[in-house]
């Protein structure tokens, strides 16, 4: 038994026929000693007398609100809730399995940007006698604070014959570091109580994996003279992280005919405009995605081809400004070839995702991630890789990136990737390995040797262990090169001499 909140206790029960249950001793919160009687909410009879009441809790009939009285006056209450475990599995009767992106997904979370603010939601068909409370932290062993509001009913839908209720909650990381590479996941815990049943649901994720930008805003068409072509232009959504030279988006432009069966024309661009052929009755849609990390695409913003005009796409609120102005050269060291580094790091991002595209749908953290990839270098909050840190002195950050590149280059050349099971001949891991080396050489100043981090001795004995390690290394490499690419993109835009 444990206390959920003041005067509310959860009794954990193994649920099987003729289970012995749990013995619970309730104590009346009063200085009184004599003449105390006990009742249970759903029964009118007196259960016992005295300052304490001992009960055997076996089933829901034993749960509920216990009240101690003296002479018609209520002295205190204790609410007992049951948490059922059947065949070693805690019950999940209250929430609906959303089955996306995989089975047993009860909580889903999204973030519009890297500010540390995110929203989680869940579904239920229950509408009465239902309460939720939400807690969150970053990491679990030494948790860092995340503040969540109250869960609220956010939508009601009719699904076939049934009503479905969507609840949501907004959370904010207390000391968010938008530019850092996350090494510890956010943990979200939802306590759900339906009548006398307690259940808890958890989700664990990195903000980078739940990013879904708002749709591009101010989508406009400008017909080009003497042509069927139009120039489509748009802006970053207001809710996206700034500066945009650092937190960059990529866009997908789609021309869709009136009929859903018509072939869609799609163009991908990093710019905020594109030239497309616009047929009558067609519409143009644009969506956005983080440029360096393959998280979710935004919803589409759309505008009809007939007549120019603004979009129907949502634009949010909050956030400000775009890229910064040109800045002075880097103190305490030569400036790197920012543009070359930008191009190569963006290529690295593409390669890292093509080497392991499905990784976003696999929860590798369940596989004891801590001991295997804890030792990889992460770009942390104090490493000066944020826009302000780069302005002040980019050398700290560049040294950190260089260390990481060498580290991953060595890992990709190690037995983990060269051993069995052999990589496919056309695997992008070889190109990835070469590009890591190329970028690290671009960064290494002449006659200047930064110290590199010791490579941990990871020698998996089994092929399946090697496979799992590859997934995990590529997964963390994706996060690392995304931050590196942001750094170089921002440097190229604002720090190039």
């Amino acid at each position: 038994i444990w206390e959920l909140k003041k005067d509310v206790y959860v009794v954990e029960l193994d649920w099987y026929p003729d289970a012995p249950g749990e013995m619970v001793v309730l104590t009346c919160d009063t200085p009184e000693e004599d003449g105390i009687t006990w009742t249970l909410d759903q029964s009118s009879e007196v259960l016992g007398s005295g300052k304490t009441l001992t009960i055997q809790v076996k089933e829901f009939g034993d749960a509920g609100q216990y009240t101690c009285h003296k002479g018609g006056e209520v002295l205190s209450h204790s609410l007992l809730l049951l948490h059922k475990k059947e065949d070693g599995i805690w019950s999940t009767d209250i929430l609906k399995d959303q089955k996306e992106p995989k089975n047993k997904t009860f909580l889903r979370c999204e973030a519009k940007n890297y500010s540390g603010r995110f929203t989680c939601w869940w579904l239920t068909t229950i509408s009465t006698d239902l309460t939720f409370s939400v807690k969150s932290s970053r990491g679990s062993s030494d948790p860092q604070g995340v503040t969540c509001g109250a869960a609220t009913l956010s939508a009601e839908r009719v699904r076939g014959d049934n009503k479905e209720y969507e609840y949501s909650v907004e959370c904010q990381e207390d000391s968010a570091c938008p530019a850092a590479e996350e090494s510890l996941p956010i943990e979200v815990m939802v306590d759900a109580v339906h009548k006398l049943k307690y259940e808890n649901y958890t989700s664990s994720f990195f903000i980078r994996d739940i990013i879904k930008p708002d749709p591009p805003k101010n989508l406009q068409l400008k017909p080009l003279k003497n042509s069927r072509q139009v120039e489509v232009s748009w802006e970053y959504p207001d809710t996206w992280s700034t500066p945009h030279s650092y937190f960059s988006l990529t866009f997908c432009v789609q021309v869709q005919g009136k009929s859903k069966r018509e072939k869609k024309a799609r163009v991908f661009t990093d710019k905020t405009s594109a030239t497309v052929i616009c047929r009558k009755n067609a519409s143009i849609s644009v969506r956005a995605q983080d440029r360096y990390y393959s998280s979710s695409w935004s919803e589409w913003a759309s505008v009809p081809c007939s007549g120019s005009g603004s979009s129907r796409g949502g634009s949010g609120s909050g956030g400000s400004g775009g890229g910064g102005s040109k800045l002075r050269a880097v103190p305490g060291g030569s400036s790197p070839a920012w543009t070359q580094c930008q191009q190569l790091s963006q290529k690295l991002c593409t390669l890292a995702w093509s080497a392991h595209p499905l990784v976003g749908h696999m929860d590798l953290r369940e596989e004891g991630d801590e001991e295997t990839t804890n030792d990889v270098p992460h770009i942390q909050c104090g490493d000066g890789c944020d826009p302000q840190g780069l302005r002040d002195n980019s050398q700290f950050c560049l040294q950190r990136i260089h260390q990481g590149l060498i580290f991953y280059e060595k890992l990709l050349g190690s037995d983990i990737f060269t051993g069995e099971p052999s990589l496919l001949p056309d695997s992008p891991v070889g190109q990835l390995h070469a590009s890591l080396l190329g970028l690290s050489q671009l960064l290494q100043p002449e006659g200047h040797h930064w110290e590199t981090q010791q490579i941990p001795s990871l020698s998996p004995s089994q092929p399946w262990q090697r496979l799992l390690l590859r997934f995990k290394i590529l997964r963390s490499l994706q996060a690392f090169v995304a931050v590196a690419a942001r750094v170089f993109a921002h440097g190229a835009a604002t720090l190039s001499p």
Partner: antibody, heavy 121, light 107 residues
Amino acid sequence: QIQLVQSGPELKKPGETVKISCKASGYTFTNYGMNWVKQAPGKGLKWMGWINTYTGEPTYADDFKGRFAFSLETSASTAYLQINNFKNEDTATYFCARSLSTMITTTFAYWGQGTLVTVSS
Amino acid sequence: SIVMTQTPKFLLVSAGDRVTITCKASQSVSNDVAWYQQKPGQSPKLLIYYASNRYTGVPDRFTGSGYGTDFTFTISTVQAEDLAVYFCQQDYSSPYTFGGGTKLEIK
């Protein structure tokens, strides 16, 4: 002991309004939700909805939205069901039913004796 | 809404017999099922809640079981005073629906 006492039978013409009362005693009225259940002659039971006796907020089943209204007179520990624009298909016995506990609203531990409302053509 | 299909509709039994009534929900209702007894000319009485918990003062010849979609109500030894209609009810999801009832008659 806990009791729910309902008002007597009613004979109504189509289009008229009927208001049934349900007086509770033997417990703290505002601690438990009050439900309303319909039973047409010779038929089964149909849950109409409930009213939160603490906040006064009613919840109606979809089939009973519009012409039906739940209300309270807390000082008199009384709940009311009003049916407007009475129709033939409203002929039934209406029961008020108290929730089993503060945590279990829609299991019905105590029932009123029922009020038969009949349409007279 | 969730449909509660109750079988059989009628039962003709002798005193002392064992009686079983079943209720099938059109989707999972966890263990949020109650059973009521309605004697002729009376209001219903709660017998079982949370699928298997006997309500205060209910004789132990009445038992309930089940989880998810399939529920059973049993009278181990029928007595003359058990002549009534028995209803199941799901109180998991709104609207809270009742089975069609089982009329128990004594030979």
